[in-house]
């Protein structure tokens, strides 16, 4: 039985040209995390394998940094980065847990007033 839950940063906003940390946390389970995948709807951004380390997809290599921890840092944000991001926790023996984050990338002046999207 899967007892775990994923906490995420939820809906977040960031300024165009800036950077943002995508973070998920798996709790309420003793399952071993074997791998965390960071994905958009149709493509893989990065993988953090517990044993083998990080893999960053080539199309994101210049703009994605691994960490902190199992999180992912997106840099040099553009408006096209707006959308859903998923953290997929592969665990043993539970299976797969998925968390969702919605990122809105705003023009500089708008972002200053976009705090309502920020989850502390």
């Amino acid at each position: 039985m899967m007892t775990g839950t994923i906490e995420t940063t939820g809906n977040i906003s960031a300024e165009k040209g800036g950077s943002i940390i995508l973070q998920c946390h798996l709790s309420s389970t003793t399952a071993q995390v074997t791998q965390v995948n960071w994905e958009q709807q149709d493509q893989l951004l990065a993988i953090c394998n517990a044993d083998l380390g990080w893999h960053i997809s080539p199309s994101f290599k210049d703009r994605v940094a691994p960490g902190p921890g199992l999180g992912l840092t997106l840099q040099s944000l553009t408006v096209n980065d707006t959308g859903e991001y998923f953290c997929i926790y592969h665990t043993y023996p539970d299976g797969t847990y998925t968390g969702r984050i919605f990122l809105e990338v705003l023009e500089s002046s708008v972002a200053e007033h976009g705090a309502r999207f920020q989850i502390p």
């Epitope: 791998q35 893989l44 993988i47 083998l52 380390g53 592969h90």
Partner: antibody, heavy 119, light 107 residues
């Protein structure tokens, strides 16, 4: 340039163990993950497992769990793969392969080591 | 484990022909697929990764595409040195798995 040089061919009896080495050069040893892939005669490629030289972390295919051990010697930039309880089906060419910085595709390959298991 | 099913298993072509090999994953692997070429008695060589980037030094006649579960590898104009066996591989999750291979032979 990146080079992976493997130890020579081995002939083993069923039930024995074999230890194959893969000496690397031409890059910073701890930057690339190293994997072992085997190929039985006339067959396809099969991933055995991988090791992260940075921390010694290993990931093995379930099929080989309990029979395979991968280790690193950072002083000589060498990776080892030991396979125990050998059977005839383990007869294959064993390759070490390196995946680049933040990558899992196998860009660098050793020349292969033929392991023959025969009574 | 994720199964990678490659087709066809063998293929005959003439120099100059366009050939296409397909690989189907048993589950969504996003864009985490690579293609290798192997000649008899030699180690495989990385050609295409993720799944449309050509590796350093790989000629432009080799290309790859796809996402999710369906992937395609194409040689736009087969050259004599291209007769070999080609493998797809997924690295979305361990254990990393390969297709069974496609042998490209001279017609």
């Amino acid at each position: 340039q990146v080079q992976l040089v493997q130890s020579g061919a081995e002939v083993k009896k069923p039930g024995a163990s074999v230890k194959v080495s893969c000496k690397t050069s031409g890059y910073t040893f701890t930057e690339y993950t190293l994997h072992w892939v085997r190929q039985a005669p006339g067959q396809g490629l099969e991933w055995i497992g991988g090791i992260n030289p940075n921390n010694g972390g290993t990931s093995y295919a379930q099929k080989f769990q309990g029979r395979v051990t991968m280790t690193v010697d950072t002083s000589t930039s060498t990776v080892y793969m030991e396979l125990s309880s050998l059977r005839s089906e383990d007869t294959a060419v064993y390759y070490c392969a390196g995946s680049g910085y933040y990558d899992y595709s196998f860009a660098y390959w050793g020349q292969g080591t033929l392991v023959t298991v025969s009574s | 484990d994720i199964q990678m099913t490659q087709s066809p298993s063998s293929l005959s072509a003439s120099v100059g022909d366009r050939v296409t090999i397909t690989c189907r994953a048993s589950q969504d692997v996003k864009n985490a697929v690579v293609w290798y070429q192997q000649k008899p008695g030699k180690a495989p060589k990385l050609l295409i990764y993720s799944p449309s980037y050509r590796y350093t030094g790989v000629p432009s006649r080799f290309s790859g595409s796809g996402s999710g579960t369906d992937f395609t590898f194409t040689i736009s104009s087969v050259q004599p040195e291209d007769f070999a066996t080609y493998y797809c591989q997924q690295h979305y999750s361990t254990p990393f798995t390969f297709g069974q291979g496609t042998k490209l032979e001279i017609k």
